[in-house]
């Protein structure tokens, strides 16, 4: 079976890394495990990994925003940032604002790698399933 | 044959959903049909679906922008929004501006699903083939 | 072997097209050659091609930004722009700013095609490996 995941925003995320909806809606999870915010690889190989995060706020103060996909493996002491997007000075002060960050690329992943998504400001994330998501598939 | 599509912007249309160039230029259409703005799936399976829309205007008034990829199937009464990007407060009032929205993710699609792209303001879309496009491929 | 590439930003790029790190870090290069900034196709077929560029500056002056993936082949006199992103009026004058452009789509590529990435303003690109990259894989 094709190894694939598409997880969608979960609004009761309260800490980092982001947590994801892995059961209901347009979710896919096949040949990959989901554990505490992370996608757990169980077969070494090439994967296309992607994520989109939708940031929005009532009154713009241009708080710097970051969106990262990173990897953790017990063999390595430190997280590896695979992809990252940053935004600064992106809206007009005081205005209602909205903006997305999209990341997607190919990586060689190893069995037991855990992939996560991190954002700089959780309170500015909107978790609609069509707007904020995290996925991968094995090539 | 690989099921794949890459359609590019078609500027002489006024209708929603967006209509696409399916014949000339860097277009691809194989194992998938194009009908009235929609990509019609004829084989159930996993697909990576993507779209980019290039918005621009002569004088910024921060009109809210949205870009959606949605699915319609005669079995379901309502459209399903698969992916969406929104922008608000994205440019400096009165200035010439330009911005893109990119969406891409994996979905389990069923034979006879129709996929479309919608935008909130057609007048602000630029339809150059390299800038505005819609595609998919079966994994 | 799967034909795949993921190249990351190389900060000693001094001219166009952008040059890329093809050896160290999270780089992938298999069944595709890298030559003077370009990915060289050696097998005709369908490829998903992607690139992300991270632009940032100390003091916003809203210099128009463009990010292009283009193709060159000795059979054709002119470069073909495959994908492009443009930004205008994207930050508040005088402020420190940061913004990304992401492109990704499917193309039918021919043996000996050379793919490159071009940006409008090299001095505004940040070359961190997680932020600026260029890749493809054969479907």
């Amino acid at each position: 079976l094709r190894k694939v995941a598409h997880l969608t925003g979960k609004s009761n995320s309260r800490s980092m890394p982001l947590e994801w909806e892995d059961t209901y809606g347009i979710v896919l999870l096949s040949g990959v495990k989901y554990k505490k915010g992370g996608l757990v690889i169980n077969e070494t190989g090439l994967y296309f990994v992607y994520s989109k995060v939708y940031f929005r706020g009532q009154s713009c103060n241009n708080l710097p925003l970051s969106h990262k996909v990173y990897m953790r493996n017990s063999k390595y002491p430190q997280d590896l940032v695979m992809m990252e997007g940053k935004m600064m000075s992106y809206c007009t002060t005081g205005q209602m604002w909205a903006r997305s960050s999209y990341l997607g690329a190919v990586f060689n992943l190893t069995s037991a790698d855990h992939l996560y998504v991190n954002v700089s400001e959780l309170s500015l994330v909107n978790f609609e399933e069509s707007q904020t998501f995290f996925g991968l598939y094995k090539l | 044959l690989r099921k794949v599509a890459h359609l590019t912007g078609k500027s002489n249309s006024r209708s929603m959903p967006l209509e696409w160039e399916d014949t000339y230029g860097i277009v691809l259409l194989s194992g998938v049909k194009y009908k009235k703005g929609g990509l019609v799936i004829n084989e159930t399976g996993l697909y990576f679906v993507y779209s980019k829309v290039y918005f621009r205007g002569q004088s910024c008034n921060n009109l809210p922008l949205s870009h959606k990829v949605y699915m319609r199937n005669s079995k379901y009464p309502q459209d399903l929004v698969m992916m969406e990007g929104k922008m608000m407060s994205y440019c400096t009032t009165g200035q010439m501006w330009a911005r893109s929205s990119y969406l891409g993710a994996v979905f389990n699609l069923t034979s006879a699903d129709h996929l479309y792209v919608n935008v909130s303001e057609l007048s602000l879309v630029n339809f150059e083939e390299s800038q505005t496009f819609f595609g998919l491929y079966k994994l | 072997l799967r034909k795949v590439a993921h190249l990351t930003g190389k900060s000693n790029s001094r001219s166009m097209p952008l040059e890329w790190e093809d050896t160290y870090g999270i780089v992938l290069l298999s069944g595709v050659k890298y030559k003077k900034g370009g990915l060289v196709i050696n097998e005709t077929g369908l490829y998903f091609v992607y690139s992300k560029v991270y632009f940032r500056g100390q003091s916003c002056n809203n210099l128009p930004l463009s990010h292009k993936v283009y193709m060159r082949n000795s059979k054709y006199p002119q470069d073909l722009v495959m994908m492009e992103g443009k930004m205008m009026s994207y930050c508040t004058t005088g402020q420190m700013w940061a913004r990304s452009s992401y492109l990704g789509a499917v193309f039918n590529l021919t043996s000996a095609d050379h793919l490159y990435v071009n940006v409008s303003e090299l001095s505004l690109v940040n070359f961190e490996e997680s932020q600026t990259f260029f890749g493809l894989y054969k479907l």
């Epitope: - | 006024r14 009109l63 949205s66 909130s120 303001e121 057609l122 007048s123 | -």
Partner: antibody, heavy 119, light 111 residues
Framework: QVQLVQSGAEVKKPGSSVKVSCKAS????????ISWVRQAPGQGLEWMGW????????QYNENFKGRVTITADKSTSTAYMELSSLRSEDTAVYFC????????????WGQGTLVTVSS | EIVMTQSPATLSVSPGERATLSCRAS??????????IHWYQQKPGQPPRLLIF???HLESGIPARFSGSGSGTEFTLTISSLQSEDFAVYYC?????????FGQGTKVEIK
């Protein structure tokens, strides 16, 4: 900058027709609708119809029962509104306005053309 | 067709005071994304000028003292502190469906 310049005032007899022009400049004529809106003396605004110069498609307010025809000439970036079977109650100022396709708000207006219908 | 009803027909306000204009649609002009209502100002002998679009968004070049709110069928245009140049007729317009229709207008006059 965006400009819409209309033709001059007209005096017409009942039963005749009038054709008002609206020349657009400062933007891509084929990417926006042109709408026509009229205003009778001392009255409110009434939308008559639109044309999309990109493909020539048009829509009309049924209140005008086939009396109105809106056309566009892409080569000169000019829109036209023709109203036939004129009656005294058609005396009004006729405005052309640029309209965004989807949002359908009128963000730029012509200066107006007074059409007087009198025997 | 959707009928737009504005109230009051005339509003007498002193300069510096707040003015609140209402517009009611005969059926909802909102979707899950936007409210398709726009406000215009018209002075004698001039064409209308767009002030607010999509219920609450300020058009480029319009002073921040103008604001719009509402959803569904009830909408409000507020002028926080009236200036002499604000005395005019104000129209709301919907664009939810065809035909586009305008309210009959509210005249804001000097008290």
């Amino acid at each position: 900058q965006v400009q819409l310049v209309q033709s001059g005032a007209e005096v017409k007899k009942p039963g005749s027709s009038v054709k008002v022009s609206c020349k657009a400049s400062g933007y891509t004529f084929t990417r926006f609708d042109i709408s026509w809106v009229r205003q009778a003396p001392g009255q409110g605004l009434e939308w008559m119809g639109w044309i999309f110069p990109g493909d020539g498609s048009s829509q009309y307010n049924e209140n005008f029962k086939g009396r109105v025809t809106i056309t566009a000439d892409k080569s000169t970036s000019t829109a036209y509104m023709e109203l036939s079977s004129l009656r005294s109650e058609d005396t009004a100022v006729y405005f052309c306005a640029r309209s965004l396709i989807s949002t359908a708000m009128f963000d730029h207006w012509g200066q107006g053309t007074l059409v007087t219908v009198s025997s | 067709e959707i009928v737009m009803t504005q109230s009051p027909a005339t509003l007498s306000v002193s300069p510096g005071e707040r003015a609140t204009l209402s517009c009611r649609a005969s059926k909802s002009v909102s979707t899950s994304d936007f409210s398709y209502i726009h406000w215009y100002q018209q002075k004698p002998g001039q064409p209308p000028r767009l002030l607010i679009f999509l219920a609450s968004h300020l058009e480029s070049g319009i002073p921040a003292r103008f604001s719009g709110s509402g959803s569904g069928t009830e909408f409000t245009l507020t002028i926080s502190s009236l200036q002499s140049e604000d005395f005019a007729v104000y129209y709301c317009q919907h664009s939810r469906e065809l035909p586009r229709t305008f309210g009959q207008g509210t005249k804001v006059e000097i008290k």
